[in-house]
Amino acid sequence: MAVTACQGLGFVVSLIGIAGIIAATCMDQWSTQDLYNNPVTAVFNYQGLWRSCVRESSGFTECRGYFTLLGLPAMLQAVRALMIVGIVLGAIGLLVSIFALKCIRIGSMEDSAKANMTLTSGIMFIVSGLCAIAGVSVFANMLVTNFWMSTANMYTGMGGMVQTVQTRYTFGAALFVGWVAGGLTLIGGVMMCIACRGLAPEETNYKAVSYHASGHSVAYKPGGFKASTGFGSNTKNKKIYDGGARTEDEVQSYPSKHDYV
């Protein structure tokens, strides 16, 4: 029962995490204009992985895609790649883990096969989560570097007469969504790996030991106990736990994408 719960929970947590990674990747607010000096601004800039946007005080928002591939910074390309790899691995992991779920019967699939699939999906979730965390962290590091560089050059003087204020960017909502989502996917993957250990049939075969009593002899076979636990290779007496099964509506939680106005 504990294994089913761990596996089911791992799947749900990973599902939420991957949904979050997808949402973060699509979001436009990876970096937002720093409003430290001017909390109310007439023009507000924010940028995503795929496009940059400008929201005017008038309420109009204009977004422009990055239509060049070669002209983009290598770091941005790397972040895009990490996020996409994370999504692809996570999606494959979800597909694999659905078939690996203990509460779902698919033909006469062996427990060993389910254990292997659970481990595979777990590893995929871990790598997916790490990709997302790495991608977001690389972008955050890029922002911090640029922030301090633009702070140093905040005011560039035209003979001391004209001030040109440089736009500084700070962490956007997508970074936090990405970090949390990556963390959840990672946790989900670890839970799947833990569940795999419980699913895997024990390989050790104990030899029957005879105990001679005074009147008659009785042979005690540990194999019988093994079957009753539900972890053994004897599947005849095995109980199928479907208490852990949940509807999709209960477990899916897709963070909605907002263009904060």
Epitope: A42, V43, N45, V54, S58, R64, Q163
Partner: antibody
Framework: EFQLQQSGPELEKPGASVRISCKTS????????MNWVKQSNGESLEWIGN????????SYNQKFKGKATLTVDKSSSTAYMQLKSLTSEDSAVYYC???????????WGQGTTLTVSS | DIVMTQSPSSLTVTAGEKVTMSCKSS????????????LTWYQQKPGQPPKLLIY???TRKSGVPDRFTGSGSGTDFTLTLSSVQAEDLAVYYC?????????FGAGTKLELK
């Protein structure tokens, strides 16, 4: 046809308060921010502040904070500006103006003349 | 606050003449996010409210005659009237739409000789 119809001229005593209205028609009132501008005796223009009719959020020119209060009534598509503690300095023509692309004011009311005199 | 300086304060012209007026801002009005200059030009005739001519420094509002042209970037802007007509006699204001508080220039008065 877009229209911003402002209330008539006002004559007030110093220390009093006044509320100027700006009734809109011909467009979605909540879709555009409403701005208020002051023009003293035919001179230059001064931005007072603006209000987002949808959320009710306001931005004020620091100079007019405490002097002007901007409100809206969505049901009647009307924007209001209240001016308090009036002095002769407040005597001017006040305009309401709709905010458009580039934060420009594309449609203006005809103006309300406020005269503060004892 | 961004200070808008217009010059000259008044211009005396003859019909059909080409006219240029200047507007300078104390800070750049160029937004790095969309590379647009948040500067607007208005025309105000006596007893009337201002009328929008040009926004984003060079985008003409629909219905505005093409003899009105806005140009410039950063801190220096120009409004050009290619051929002045009698109905163009008015006061022209530039406005900073980039940073709060939104500020206006003192205006350039266009008069007929």
């Amino acid at each position: 046809e877009f229209q911003l119809q402002q209330s008539g001229p006002e004559l007030e005593k110093p220390g009093a308060s006044v509320r100027i209205s700006c009734k809109t028609s011909g467009y979605s009132f909540t879709g555009y921010n409403m701005n208020w501008v002051k023009q003293s005796n035919g001179e230059s223009l001064e931005w007072i502040g603006n209000i987002d009719p949808y959320y009710g959020g306001t931005s004020y020119n620091q100079k007019f904070k405490g002097k002007a209060t901007l409100t809206v009534d969505k049901s009647s598509s009307t924007a209001y500006m209240q001016l308090k503690s009036l002095t002769s300095e407040d005597s001017a023509v006040y305009y309401c103006a709709r905010m458009y692309h580039g934060n420009a004011f594309d449609y203006w009311g005809q103006g309300t003349t406020l005269t503060v005199s004892s | 606050d961004i200070v808008m300086t217009q010059s000259p304060s008044s211009l005396t012209v003859t019909a059909g003449e080409k006219v240029t007026m200047s507007c300078k801002s104390s800070q750049s009005l160029l937004n790095s996010g969309n590379l647009k200059n948040y500067l607007t030009w208005y025309q105000q005739k006596p007893g009337q409210p201002p009328k929008l001519l040009i926004y984003w420094a060079s985008t003409r509002k629909s219905g505005v005659p093409d003899r009105f042209t806005g140009s410039g970037s950063g801190t220096d802007f120009t409004l050009t009237l290619s051929s002045v007509q009698a109905e163009d006699l008015a006061v022209y204001y530039c406005q900073n739409d980039y940073s709060y508080p939104l500020t206006f220039g003192a205006g350039t008065k266009l008069e007929l000789k």
